[in-house]
């Protein structure tokens, strides 16, 4: 029997699990107060690598520590449109087979739709989450995870795959988005920035977080991942933002402490099994959900994205280790491995909690909430 994760579960890393309401609903600016670029450029619009700064141009700035207390959206910059210095980039030199269009990288050539036409689809990921516009869906119940607390043996494969660091998960990690929506976890990986430059894939009101974890799941309706590509609900990803906190996160340290061993592209090591759920926020009941795509080629659509409202806290040193240890192809640092946010094109992001409720006396007019489209309402 699957049991939802309990609210009173101990926080990660001895009390640094993250803010309870990082994307806090109160005092949200109204639509008119937050101008932003509606249609950020796709990969094909990114500058070529010669237009992008190399590592030597990146300032060695420590990420600023968030102030104590709940992070509110009004504390966040409302405009951080793609095209600014935090635009995703890959400092890689071109592969030896430079004219080969069958692979991809962050920024520059080849344009992703040339690698996979699906990358030009209308319902792509990641997206900018605007809690004010999310549809509250009471039918979205707490996520259920079973078998995520792994014993030390057998060990797991931690690999620098040239695009991210990937932890391959063994059979038996079950996740349910709701009744009859059951999945098996396949792998987890991270997205990050560079020194002083955030690198989450999803954004909230234009705010980009330091990093983001993705746990990729396959629907139990499919035996193999390639069979599920492009099938609605065939794949599901749990995503959480990583932020800077005052303490070391002991769960993440089990992985981060091993990154030096896999600094080279294509290298791997074995790590003892760990509690995978400890890498996620403790609150499994508050999240945003929408249908999108893989964030790398082949960019297949039909992927169910669940983005936690609560963040996970890592120390400044840990975030620096994440962004400054690994190397990609061509003797380039593996950094800024995130895709630009993609237009919603009419999609409505759903929330398992009333994220759009504006209790602020500043609101001149009532907030227009989107209606919930979740099945079972």
């Amino acid at each position: 029997q699957r049991l939802p994760r309990m609210q009173e579960d101990s926080p990660l890393g001895g009390g640094s699990s993250g803010e309870d309401d990082p994307l806090g609903e109160e005092d949200l600016p109204s639509e008119e107060d937050s101008p932003r670029e509606e249609d950020p450029p796709g990969e094909e619009d990114l500058p070529g690598e010669e237009d992008l700064p190399g590592e030597e141009d990146l300032p060695e700035v420590k990420p600023k520590s968030e102030e104590e207390g709940s992070l509110k959206l009004e504390d966040l910059p409302t405009v951080e449109a793609p095209g600014d210095p935090q635009e995703p980039q890959n400092n890689a030199h071109r592969d030896k087979e430079g004219d080969d269009q069958s692979h991809w990288r962050y920024g520059g050539d080849p344009p992703w739709p040339r690698v996979s036409p699906a990358c030009a689809g209308r319902f792509q990921s990641p997206v900018d989450i605007r809690p004010q516009l999310a549809a509250f869906c009471p039918a979205l119940r707490p996520l259920e995870l079973l078998g995520f607390q792994l014993p030390p043996l057998p060990e797991l494969r931690l690999r620098n795959n040239g695009h991210s660091v990937q932890l391959t998960l063994p059979p038996g990690l079950e996740m349910a988005l709701g009744p009859g929506r059951e999945y098996r976890a396949l792998q987890l990986h991270l997205h990050w920035g560079a020194a002083g430059r955030p690198g989450s894939e999803h954004t909230v009101e234009g705010h980009r977080f330091p990093a983001e974890i993705h746990v990729v799941h396959l629907s139990t309706a499919f035996a193999r991942v390639d069979e599920a590509l492009g099938r609605p609900g065939g794949l599901a990803v749990l995503a959480a933002f990583l932020e800077e906190g005052p303490e070391e996160n002991s769960a993440y340290e089990q992985l981060l402490s091993r990154l030096e061993e896999i600094a080279e592209e294509g290298s791997e090591t074995q790590v003892p099994g760990l509690d995978i759920s400890a890498l996620l926020p403790s609150d499994f009941s508050r999240y945003f959900q929408y249908e999108g795509s893989l964030t790398t080629p082949p960019c297949a659509q039909g992927v169910i994205w669940t983005v936690f409202n609560q963040t996970v806290m890592l120390s400044a040193k840990q975030l620096h280790t994440l962004s400054d240890t690994l190397w990609g192809p061509g003797d380039s640092r593996l950094q800024l491995n995130f895709r630009a946010t993609q237009p919603l094109n009419g999609r409505v992001i759903e929330a398992s909690f009333p994220a759009g409720v504006d209790s602020s006396p500043r609101a001149a007019e009532p907030v227009q909430l989107n209606s919930c489209l979740a099945a079972g309402d």
Partner: nanobody, 119 residues
Framework: QVQLVESGGGLVQPGGSLRLSCAAS????????MGWYRQAPGKQRELVAT???????NYADSVKGRFTISRDNSKNTLYLQMNSLRAEDTAVYYC?????????????WGQGTLVTVSS
């Protein structure tokens, strides 16, 4: 549907050479890493050599200087040139392809090709 077809195995005398090939087929494959692994009778499967998308190679100590891994990205084909073969190289050799499918690498394995080094 991904298919891996290995070829080139066979019987060879000590000191001889063989060249293994592995062709990957399927629609719109995005291949990240590729590699060769081997399993001798009664032993665990072990790494022989791997090559990344950008051409970075890694070899098991026991084959360094004797084996050369290479790949042709345009043909989705992997090769293993094996020189100065020894009796202890006798094993079933498996092709491994790490396909980039769902925001990460997913392993696919060939059926294996038998290499026997014997006089």
């Amino acid at each position: 549907q991904v298919q891996l077809v290995e070829s080139g195995g066979g019987l060879v005398q000590p000191g001889g050479s063989l060249r293994l090939s592995c062709a990957a087929s399927g629609s719109a494959l995005i291949i990240n890493a590729m590699g060769w692994y081997r399993q001798a009778p009664g032993k665990q499967r072990e790494l022989v050599a791997t090559v990344t998308r950008s051409g970075r190679t890694n070899y098991a100590d026991s084959v360094k200087g004797r084996f050369t891994i290479s790949r042709d990205n345009s043909k989705n084909t992997l090769y293993l040139q094996m020189n100065s073969l020894r009796a202890e190289d006798t094993a079933v050799y498996y092709c491994n392809v790490a396909l980039w499918i769902a925001d990460g690498e997913y392993d696919y394995w060939g059926q294996g090709t038998l290499v026997t080094v014997s006089s």
